[in-house]
């Protein structure tokens, strides 16, 4: 009876999410493997988040709006492990917008989700950021490693969206 009511709840939750995400990929987790954590297909998952790499070339503001429509934000990178996971799926000759910007050019960087900007957990390439006119951050491959660079926000780039996993 307990399992039946849990399944019914899950199905109704799935139906609820289906209007936003036509397909979800779910895995069982939790100590009794009773919880399902899901990401929209074909997003990838890492820890408690889902990631989507957009190959559409758009300005930073348009990229953020595009993520927002999908219930996400441009990616906020909190750890080196998270960055290493993300970069596995990136092309080394491309650049991708992050959810990091400095709209006034005062070198006051801010994450789109209001996560505090911690200078100790940043992965800028050597010599970056280097221009107050370049107010948006990308991740790209340079000098044999992935790192961040400040660029003009209006110049179209690919982008990475991030959202919290859906638990059902």
């Amino acid at each position: 009876n307990f399992m039946y009511s849990k399944t019914v709840k899950r199905l109704s939750k799935l139906q609820e999410y289906q209007q936003y995400y036509p397909s979800l990929t779910c895995v069982m987790e939790g100590k009794d493997m009773e919880d399902w954590s899901c990401c929209p297909t074909p997003w990838t998952s890492f820890q408690s988040s889902c990631y989507f790499i957009s190959t559409v070339m758009q300005s930073w503001t348009k990229s953020q709006n595009n993520c927002s429509v999908m219930g996400a934000d441009l990616v906020v990178i909190n750890t080196k492990e998270e960055q290493d996971f993300i970069t596995q799926n990136l092309k080394i000759n491309s650049a991708y917008f992050l959810g990091l910007s400095d709209p006034k050019g005062w070198r006051h960087w801010q994450w789109v989700d209001q996560t505090p900007y911690n200078k100790n957990v940043t992965f800028w390439h050597s010599g970056e950021p280097n221009s107050p006119d370049e107010r948006c951050a990308i991740i790209n491959f340079r000098s044999e490693e992935w790192g961040w660079n400040d660029v003009h926000c209006h110049v179209p780039q690919k982008s990475i969206c991030k959202m919290k996993k859906i638990y059902i």
Epitope: S59, W60, N65, P103, S131, P132, D133, H152, C153, H154
Partner: antibody, heavy 121, light 111 residues
Amino acid sequence: EVQLVESGGGLVKPGGSLRLSCAASGFTFRSYGMSWVRQAPGKRLEWVSTISSGDSYTYYPDSVKGRFTISRDNAKNSLYLQMNSLRAEDTAVYYCARQIYYDYAYYFDFWGQGTTVTVSS
Amino acid sequence: DIVLTQSPDSLAVSLGERATINCRASESVSFRTSHLMHWYQQKPGQPPKLLIYGASNLESGVPDRFSGSGSGTDFTLTISSLQAEDVAVYFCQQSIEDPPTFGGGTKVEIK
């Protein structure tokens, strides 16, 4: 006082080339992105190209891509536009303009007086 | 590309009266509190001159009879009390994404 002075315009046959120059004074030229904007008779203003302050970024609309090249010489406080394979539709007054960044975008705060390019056989 | 449509194409206003020019973008040129539309004035035989940046910020040296407002896709330039020297063509411009684009212009004349 900020000044932008364009030169190099003139009459050229279709398929020909011209090099426009813009001499800048009254400001620290190397610190600013610069653009060329044109205005054909009776038409709206049309952006032609942009170059970033550090020369790392250039951008063109499809209408001129592959034919026009923007460049700058910060030592000479000069901006250039090399125009090849010119067409009748390139006929316009060409302005050089200084860019000022504002939040996620930019505007043009100073414009030169313009130089006229006429493409005709 | 973002298309900017200005209205009206031309406007005749009596001296001392209010002139209102509209600019509509084909998609939003705002992001959160940033409204990325700018306005220019162009007199015959002269280059454009910046009046308003960021939808509502008056450029230094521009008389305060000029003002701007709007957000998203709809923006307005207002001349509160038209003076003879305001006879010109007025353009809006966006640069939230490349390529930057301009409106078709509104010609302001004296009635």
